[in-house]
Interface confidence: low
């Protein structure tokens, strides 16, 4: 007997690392293997149209799963039976079951990270599951789906007792049949009074809505078409065994004539439109490395040619509650360093024939901005900066300090929270910028914190190119060039003139241009010129010069 279908459900979740063996396998969902790797592509079995009461349940045969060690998933049952009540409308939802409406538009949808990654699930004790799609591709995507959180116990099979009364021309004769639907979907009919036997339907009628699952064999590169019927049907030319048509070549049509003793001629002629080979498609991560912290790009690539009409191929992605009917999807504004799960499938003529799931972890994001605590100078040649590190992951810091147009940058260890700047220029404004960075798929720099300080004054350097020249017998002209480093706020030149050890003149000018008059004739003088920056005097430049004997 087939497993009891779960309530229709859709979950976005991180793949569990161990099989959830106690959970029921939903009808027509692909069993994925445990996510020891982040991607698995599967052969897919699919039911696409509503089933008649004769076919209320189907099961995925174990060999259709590519020998996967299957774990069970809570997914959307692809069995859609408008003729009969389903679990979705007959079963009271268990505690912790939400109902959510999904639509094909992702405009207002928010993609949440998979539970169990960096995001915190808001359902206590929730277990992560793989997800599947609403699988009837011809139904609108605005189906209301029940988001089923796992229960380790399978839901009990629902038994529906339906009394069918057949009225005949003999008014006093009533035929009452009780039809019990067993979990396998076969009908057990207990008859109390049989007055009339309804005529058999034609096989063309009975199997009008027959559905097919295509199972691919990667070794032989051939498909098997599994006919979704409960009874063992017969096929013309003995083309099928156990309701399976074997050895179908990709992209070729095959015709199967279906009959059964429960129906009459004409037989159902089923045209099998075989999809392309599964390995001709590859799900490719097309995310740009620069944007891999907040975006995910996934794209189906055709890696080999095939003869199927590409117009008949449709693609579908589901990431969280967003569904896209595109060959390529791009998700933006995601959280860095979070895992996101995307399921995708390819359909041929609305028959699903392959699927893949990817769990992608977004890259490390840019680190936050460090918070500067101290940033100042209390000395002429040193400064200090201390900071709080950013909250997000980072590898190291870059500290840059700029004076006028010169810029120096240092790479600092991630554990540092303080740096002493040495050999700075006195009385100079320094602008500092500090940012953290992380080397991920690319290097990402965080926002820079900025600060500035001005170093303290220091003694200026010596004046240079000092000259002393006689302008007359008792007059001298003293000139010099400004110091290379002023190291302070002001600009003043001083000249001291000594004769022997006696200071005879002390002058101060804005420019280094002194005219010294009325000196003693024939006397040796010492001329000392220095610069004063308002805080400190510089080293004097010293020259000796003598006045001449008066010419008059």
């Amino acid at each position: 007997q087939s497993p009891t279908p779960s309530p229709t459900g859709l979950t976005t979740a991180k793949m569990p690392s161990v099989p959830l063996s106690s959970d029921p396998l939903p009808t027509h969902t692909t069993a994925f293997s445990p996510a020891s790797t982040f991607e698995r592509e599967n052969d897919f079995s699919e039911t696409t149209t509503s089933l008649s009461p004769d076919n209320t349940s189907t099961q995925v045969s174990p060999d259709s799963l590519d020998n996967a060690s299957a774990f069970n998933t809570t997914g959307v049952s692809s069995v859609q039976t408008p003729h009969l009540p389903t679990h979705a409308d007959s079963q009271t939802p268990s505690a912790g079951t939400d109902t959510q409406t999904f639509s094909g538009s992702a405009a207002n949808a928010k993609l949440n990270p998979t539970p169990g990654s960096n995001a915190i699930s808001d359902v206590p004790g929730e277990r992560s599951t793989a997800s599947t799609f609403p699988t009837d591709p011809v139904s609108p995507l605005t189906t209301t789906l029940s988001l089923a959180h796992h229960s380790s116990a399978a839901l009990p099979a629902r038994t529906s007792n339906t009394t069918i009364t057949a009225n005949t021309s003999d008014a006093y004769l009533n035929a009452s049949e009780t039809t019990t639907l067993s979990p396998s979907g076969s009908a057990v009919i207990s008859t109390t009074t049989i007055a009339t036997t309804p005529s058999k339907p034609t096989c063309d009628e009975k199997y009008a809505n027959i559905t097919v699952d295509y199972l691919y064999n990667k070794e032989t590169k051939l498909f098997t078409a599994k006919l979704n019927v409960n009874e063992n049907v017969e096929c013309g030319n003995n083309t099928c065994t156990n309701n399976e048509v074997h050895n179908l070549t990709e992209c070729k049509n095959a015709s199967v004539s279906i009959s059964h003793n429960s129906c009459t001629a004409p037989d159902k002629t089923l045209i099998l439109d075989v999809p392309p080979g599964v390995e001709k498609f590859q799900l490719h991560d097309c995310t740009q490395v620069e944007k891999a912290d907040t975006t995910i790009c996934l794209k189906w690539k055709n890696i080999e040619t095939f003869t199927c009409d590409t117009q008949n191929i449709t693609y579908r992605f589901q990431c969280g509650n967003m569904i896209f009917d595109n060959k390529e999807i791009k998700l933006e504004n995601l959280e860095p360093e979070h895992e996101y799960k995307c399921d995708s499938e390819i359909l041929y003529n609305n028959h699903k024939f392959t699927n893949a799931s990817k769990i992608i972890k977004t890259d490390f994001g840019s680190p936050g901005e460090p918070q500067i605590i101290f940033c100042r100078s209390e000395a002429a040649h040193q400064g200090v900066i201390t900071w709080n590190p950013p909250q997000r992951s980072f590898h190291n810091f870059t500290l840059c300090y700029i004076k006028e147009t010169e810029k120096d940058c240092l790479n600092l260890d991630k554990n540092l929270i303080k740096y002493d700047l040495q050999n700075l220029k006195p009385y100079t404004k320094y602008v500092l910028s500090l940012h953290a960075y992380i080397i991920a798929k690319v290097q990402r720099n965080g926002s820079a914190a900025m600060c500035h300080f001005t170093t303290k004054s220091a003694p200026p350097s010596q004046v240079w190119n000092m000259t002393v020249s006689m302008t007359s017998d008792n007059s001298m002209h003293v000139k010099c060039r400004p110091p290379r480093d002023r190291n302070g706020p002001h600009e003043r030149y001083h000249l001291e003139v000594e004769a022997g050890n006696t200071l005879v003149r002390n002058e101060s000018h804005k420019n280094c241009d002194f005219r010294v008059k009325d000196l003693q004739y024939s006397t040796d003088y010492t001329f000392k010129a220095y610069f004063h920056n308002g805080d400190y005097p510089g080293e004097p430049f010293i020259l000796h010069h003598s006045t001449s004997y008066n010419s008059k």
């Epitope: 605590i373 100042r376 000395a379 040193q382 200090v384 929270i417 303080k418 600060c451």
Partner: antibody, heavy 122, light 112 residues
Amino acid sequence: QEQLVESGGGLVQPEGSLTLTCTASGFSFSGNYYMCWVRQAPGKGLEWIGCLYTGSSGSTYYASWAKGRFTISKTSSTTVTLQMTSLTAADTATYFCARDLGYEIDGYGGLWGQGTLVTVSS
Amino acid sequence: AQVLTQTPSPVSAVVGGTVSISCQASQSVYNNNNLSWYQQKPGQPPKLLIYDASKLASGVPSRFKGSGSGTQFTLTISGVQCDDAATYYCLGGYYSSGWYFAFGGGTKVVVK
């Protein structure tokens, strides 16, 4: 000469409020300082209350016991205040204002004020 | 909350001798070295002696030495002088979404 002077201490009733002021001289807070308050009950040890970063972010940090009752603010380029509410006898202490707690910057060890005594009593 | 436990008071020292005061943190201080030592004399504010666990503050005699890392720190005074009689406090800095400081309970040093 750089200095810190605390003011505003005195006698206050239980459940009352008080604001202490720390005034800097010889420097201003434009230099991005880390101004902290520390208290010392009579005959007891030092207890950290909280700190304010005087830079543009103006971040404040508090001891867990001080959150909610104590608020540190920069009121001018040379003053920082400590607002205290719901005072009890356990808050009786000398309150110190300190700069650069636990650090030395360019040869300047952390600067402390002389403290101001707060007595909570009815 | 972080707790810093110091050597119980009082600790006796003799002039010229050596005295060690320990400070144990309940959690590693930030960067394993964000610990400073203060000296306080009656009626005075504390004075910084050691910062970053082992760096000597300016103007502090070299007979004061700080050592340790993580959770265990020691202040050693060698060649003790009468002027060293005071209470010594350790101060730990922690960072977790913001700064947090904690003082040790203090250790009184009596010089004989």
